[in-house]
Structures are given as structure tokens and as C-alpha cells.
């Protein structure tokens, strides 16, 4: 290809507009002001420019702004965001809410890229922690979000932006992640009377420790089976059969279909027989009468 | 998948015509974006006629009043007429379509193979 440096006559852009589709990478290159295109950045998201033409206009804006473009151009970036890489982002200080919203619009109906894990990433950063209204906006347009980040960086979570969660939010979220906002929604939802407790804690509760399920089963909460099944194994093992009764109210009956699944296979193996034939489901594999039963763990504690 | 394929290029005398026909699939070009680029030995691409709903039809300077880019929607094709060619129209010309999201803005873009149009005596 012919390489053109001079802008051809009368072809100096006097504005951003759509006769630029119009020019050659080169043209391009000579014709557009820097300046102006920063200025008028918001105009380049309306013209249908090539991916090769934005990579011309990317250029221009990284020879003006080499240690990292202003707030002011990033937030009208649109999609000539696409073209920017993790490094460029990592250059960026974003700080205003409206900025990350206009640039997660731009990748909205995408898997979340490099270039947007960047972004939001210095964006908390930047904030010092994850507010309501951050969290609010990164899981309207990512809800695996919050289940995508480490243990260490939920604690960074204050319980106040707990209420943005929904209970979708927390699907791919495994227990150590759970036993980090657990506590944090335990102490945001501590106000609320016993049923709404209930219903907003519930997705939480795969963090719970055994008090807390002792204290629910006495207050007629019914939680489904699948609440059960995602609770944390070492928190249900020393539940009794009443507690777990309780707990359960009416579902009760589905622990038979779950006999052989964690963590109700654990629990019957810690159950005496008698207690389990209580509840009139045919669950087996409890400890037989008559035996005594010996906490090993409490022994070699004790020795 | 998206396809864009391009036919109709070749050779022409100084003075003749041509229509270049581009045909799409799996994107319709009404409500989108659909234009010709070309490419000329040693020079780098450019937009030689567009159209869209946003933007309406728009013709580089060079061609303007030699050639006429419409669309078949029934057959989903972005056509080309070129008229009173001539040597500097020479180049390998390449079908462009690019997606119009409904939050405003454009989305992906597809390029045809191109086909070669010489005009030669």
C-alpha cells in the first residue's frame, strides 16, 4: 500500500461526521485533527465506521493521550471500546458510574471480555470497595458477576450493597464464596421480621453455620429441597432429625429422593435409625439401635 | 452464520457498464447498513457507495453520477449499476454489511471475498 502522509486538499476534516466513512485509512490518518475527534468523540458511535477505520481513529486518540485517555473521551468511546486492549484500560481512571454504564452497553448480549474484567476491575479499584449501585449495575448486566470474584475481593463487599443481590446473582457461587456474604446479608437482613428474613437470606444460606439452621428451624421457615441441598455439608451434620424437620416443614418428604445425595447421605449416616423411621419417609443407613456412637473428633481434641 | 458473496465483476471496455450483485445470509441488509468498498493495485480500501435506513445512500465523489447502489429486499441483495467506466475504476470490489443495534450505534461488520472489475481497452 502507497503511504500518504499530506492531506490531500480540501479534504481536512472540519468535523466528525459521516462523509468521513468515505476516507482512506491514510486520509484518515492526515485529514482528522486529534484534538477534534476527542472533542466529538460521541459523533463517531452514530457513523458506521470499518473496524480498520476505527483502528485509525484509536491511533490518533493514543498519540494524544499516550498515558491514557480523560474520563471525558472514555465515556463516548462507544464501540471503538471494542478496540481497546486490556493494557490501554489499565491506563484508564474511571470513576463516574454513568462511564461504566456506557461502556458495558456497548458489550451488553456478550460474554464478559478481558477488556470489560479490566474495566470493572479498576473501576472498584478506584472506588475503594463495591457499592450498591455498582453492584446494582455490574449484575444487571453480568448477574454471574459477584460469583466470579475471589473470597478476598467479596470481603471488599460492604452488607449495605447486599440488597442489590438477587438470588440469581449467587448461581455459580461456590461455599467459600457463600461463607463470605453470608455474614454480610445475615447483618443487612438483620432488621426484617421472620418471613421476609427468610425469603432474602435464603440464597445465602450455603454460608450458613449449624446455630444459624438451628435458630431457622424454629421459626416455621419451610425451605425447599433445594435450599437444603446447597446448604454446607459440616453445617447440617449436627442438626437431629427434629431440627431438620422443622427446617423443612412440608418438603420434608423430599429428603427420600435425595437419600444418596451430599448433604443429606452424610446426615442419615449421623442419624440413629429410630429417630430417622420417625419420619415415616423409609430413609435407611442410619446408626443402628443400641450402638454407641463416639465423637472422634471431640476425643483427640480432648487428648 | 454470516456470508456475504459478491458476482457480476470482469471485464469491461472503457465506457461500459456493469452491476455487481451482493447477496447476504444470516443478516438482512434492510435496517442495516450495506455498502461497496474497492481496493485499486497499491492503494489501501475505500467506500464507493453505501445505504442505509439511518443514513440514506451517500456515493464517494469520483462516482457520483456514474453509479447507483440499491437494495433488493425481497432477495436480500445490495446491487451496484456502475456506468461510464473507466481505468481508475479498476480494483477488486468488496461487499460491506454491518449490523444497526436497536440501542443505537453498529455492531459487526461483514466483509465479501471481492470480485475483480478491470477496466481495460
Known amino acids: 500500500e502507497v503511504e500518504k502522509t499530506a492531506c490531500p486538499s480540501g479534504k481536512k476534516a472540519p468535523e466528525i461526521d459521516e462523509s468521513l466513512i468515505f476516507y482512506k485509512k491514510w486520509e484518515l490518518e492526515a485529514c482528522v485533527d486529534a484534538a477534534l475527534l476527542a472533542t466529538q468523540m460521541d459523533r463517531v458511535n452514530a457513523i458506521p465506521f470499518t473496524y480498520e477505520q476505527l483502528d485509525v481513529l484509536k491511533h490518533k486518540l493514543d498519540e494524544l493521550y499516550p498515558q491514557g485517555y480523560p474520563e471525558s473521551v472514555i465515556q463516548h468511546l462507544g464501540y471503538l471500546f471494542l478496540k481497546m486492549s486490556p493494557e490501554d484500560i489499565r491506563k484508564w481512571n474511571v470513576t463516574s458510574l454513568e462511564t461504566l454504564k456506557a461502556l458495558l452497553e456497548v458489550n451488553k448480549g456478550h460474554e464478559m471480555s478481558p477488556q470489560v474484567a479490566t474495566l470493572i476491575d479498576r473501576f472498584v479499584k478506584g472506588r475503594g470497595q463495591l457499592d450498591k449501585d455498582t453492584l446494582d449495575t455490574l449484575t444487571a448486566f453480568y448477574p454471574g458477576y459477584l460469583c466470579s470474584l475471589s473470597p478476598e475481593e467479596l470481603s471488599s463487599v460492604p452488607p449495605s450493597s447486599i440488597w442489590a443481590v438477587r438470588p440469581q446473582d449467587l448461581d455459580t457461587c461456590d461455599p467459600r464464596q457463600l461463607d463470605v456474604l453470608y455474614p454480610k446479608a445475615r447483618l443487612a437482613f438483620q432488621n426484617m421480621n421472620g418471613s421476609e428474613y427468610f425469603v432474602k437470606i435464603q440464597s445465602f444460606l450455603g454460608g450458613a453455620p449449624t446455630e444459624d439452621l438451628k435458630a431457622l428451624s424454629q421459626q416455621n421457615v419451610s425451605m425447599d429441597l433445594a435450599t437444603f441441598m446447597k446448604l454446607r455439608t459440616d453445617a447440617v451434620l449436627p442438626l437431629t432429625v427434629a431440627e431438620v424437620q422443622k427446617l423443612l416443614g412440608p418438603h420434608v418428604e423430599g429428603l427420600k429422593a435425595e437419600e444418596r445425595h451430599r448433604p443429606v447421605r452424610d446426615w442419615i449416616l449421623r442419624q440413629r435409625q429410630d429417630d430417622l423411621d420417625t419420619l415415616g419417609l423409609g430413609l435407611q443407613g442410619g446408626i443402628p439401635n443400641g450402638y454407641l456412637v463416639l465423637d472422634l473428633s471431640m476425643q483427640e481434641a480432648l487428648s | 452464520e454470516v456470508q456475504v458473496v459478491e458476482s457480476g465483476g470482469g471485464l469491461v471496455q472503457p465506457g461500459g457498464s456493469l452491476r455487481l450483485s451482493c447477496a447476504a445470509s444470516?443478516?438482512?441488509?434492510?435496517?442495516?447498513?450495506g455498502g461497496w468498498f474497492r481496493q485499486a493495485p497499491g492503494e489501501q480500501r475505500e467506500l464507493v457507495a453505501s445505504?442505509?435506513?439511518?443514513?440514506?445512500?451517500k456515493y464517494a465523489d469520483p462516482v457520483k453520477g456514474r453509479f447507483t447502489i440499491s437494495t433488493d429486499t425481497a432477495k436480500n441483495t445490495v446491487d451496484l449499476q456502475m456506468n461510464s467506466l473507466g481505468p481508475e475504476d479498476t480494483a477488486v470490489y468488496y461487499c460491506?454489511?454491518?449490523?444497526?443495534?436497536?440501542?443505537?450505534?453498529?455492531?459487526?461488520?461483514?466483509w465479501g471475498q471481492g470480485t475483480q472489475v478491470t477496466v481495460s481497452s
Open positions: 444470516g443478516i438482512t441488509f434492510s435496517g442495516n447498513y
Open positions: 460491506y454489511a454491518r449490523v444497526r443495534l436497536s440501542r443505537g450505534g453498529w455492531g459487526s461488520e461483514y
Open positions: 445505504m442505509s435506513s439511518a443514513l440514506g445512500t
